[in-house]
């Protein structure tokens, strides 16, 4: 019989109200043995996966998703879900990220949610986490 998977938890560091241009890290936590953590936003419409999972305690694992420079488009509802083979867990509760104007900060009216949320272990200069979708035309990326 498959084990019942506990719901994950979600938190944000340093908090859920972030000045424009500042950084925020979402922390997803679940049981040990998690293979993939997924940070979903806005009712499953988009998500970001990572398998860069660390052990937070003897009974918990976690993954951290960092947005280096928060934009207005990053505001919204976020939640976590995890994959512990052979199945996905239920979703965590929602966490709402609010972005507040910092005086003199650049206006950022993007409608597409920023995609720079990635595990803190990842470099931040890769197309996987940049705001624009990766395009073969932008870099000489090939598979052969």
């Amino acid at each position: 019989q498959e084990e019942d998977l506990p719901r994950p938890s979600i938190s944000a560091e340093p908090g859920t109200v972030i000045p424009l241009g500042s950084h925020v890290t979402f922390v997803c936590r679940g049981p040990v043995g998690v293979q993939t953590f997924r940070l979903e936003r806005d009712s499953r419409s988009t998500y970001n996966d990572t398998e860069d999972v660390s052990q937070a305690s003897p009974s918990e694992s976690e993954a951290r998703f960092r947005i280096d420079s928060v934009r207005e488009g990053n505001a919204g509802l976020y939640r976590c879900i995890y994959y512990k083979p052979p199945k996905w867990s239920e979703q965590s509760d929602y966490l709402e990220l609010l972005v507040k104007e910092s005086s003199g900060g650049p206006d950022s009216p993007d409608t597409e949610p920023g995609s720079s949320a990635g595990p803190t272990q990842r470099p931040s200069d890769n197309s996987h986490n940049e705001h624009a979708p990766a395009s073969q035309g932008l870099k000489a990326e090939h598979l052969y």
Epitope: Q35, T36, R38, R41, R44, S45, T46, Y47, N48, D49, T50, E51, D52, V53, Y83, W88, E112, P113, G114, S115, A117, G118, P119, Q121, R122, P123, N126, S127, H128, N129, H131, A132, P133, A134, S135, Q136, K139, A140, E141, H142, L143
Partner: antibody
Amino acid sequence: ESGGGLVQPEGSLTLTCTASGFSFSNSYYMCWVRQAPGKGLEWIGCIYTGSSSGTYYASWAEGRFTISKTPSTTVTLQMTSLTAADTATYFCSRKLTNFNGAYLDLWGPGTLVTVSS
Amino acid sequence: ELVLTQTPASVEAAVGGTVTIKCQASQSIYSYLAWYQQKPGQPPKVLIYKASTLASGVPSRFKGSGSGTEFTLTISDLECADAATYYCQNNNGGSDNTFGGGTEVVVK
């Protein structure tokens, strides 16, 4: 992709995919997809290029197909107990999963595997 | 196991016309669907991801819609260059990366 060619029934073959212009340290999924002559696309499986190297397979591929990677830029597909039904062009592709969506954004040209005696 | 059913298997339309391709999932996949175009002898190319978001460099004549179990790809103002086979794919992760059976578009 490389390593394709003619192989005997019940034989084995390993295909190799090499990435250029991006690094596996950025934690992508690298996937294999195949296409039999005149048929549709069939997903085989993916491997995560980050530290966990987690693998995922289509149910039909589990056991006979093994995906692995080197730390830098190479992914392999090991195939065993091949039959004529495995004759296909095998594509390597990169899967993005981020807030812009999830999709296979980069593809190799494909390598043909023919299983015949 | 998830199944994606694409209809029709083949469709023919005139230059300047409109083609609609449907993709039905056997269970909800939310918005985790991408559409690809493949021409003979070439690897597929992504057109639409997240069910309705146009990939970089793809003309706005291509439109994706739907969520849950019902998805549609609409190609308007057909051009000869649109003659190809089109595939939908679930991208939910885990072992759910299934492709639909494909739809061949013939442009007259």
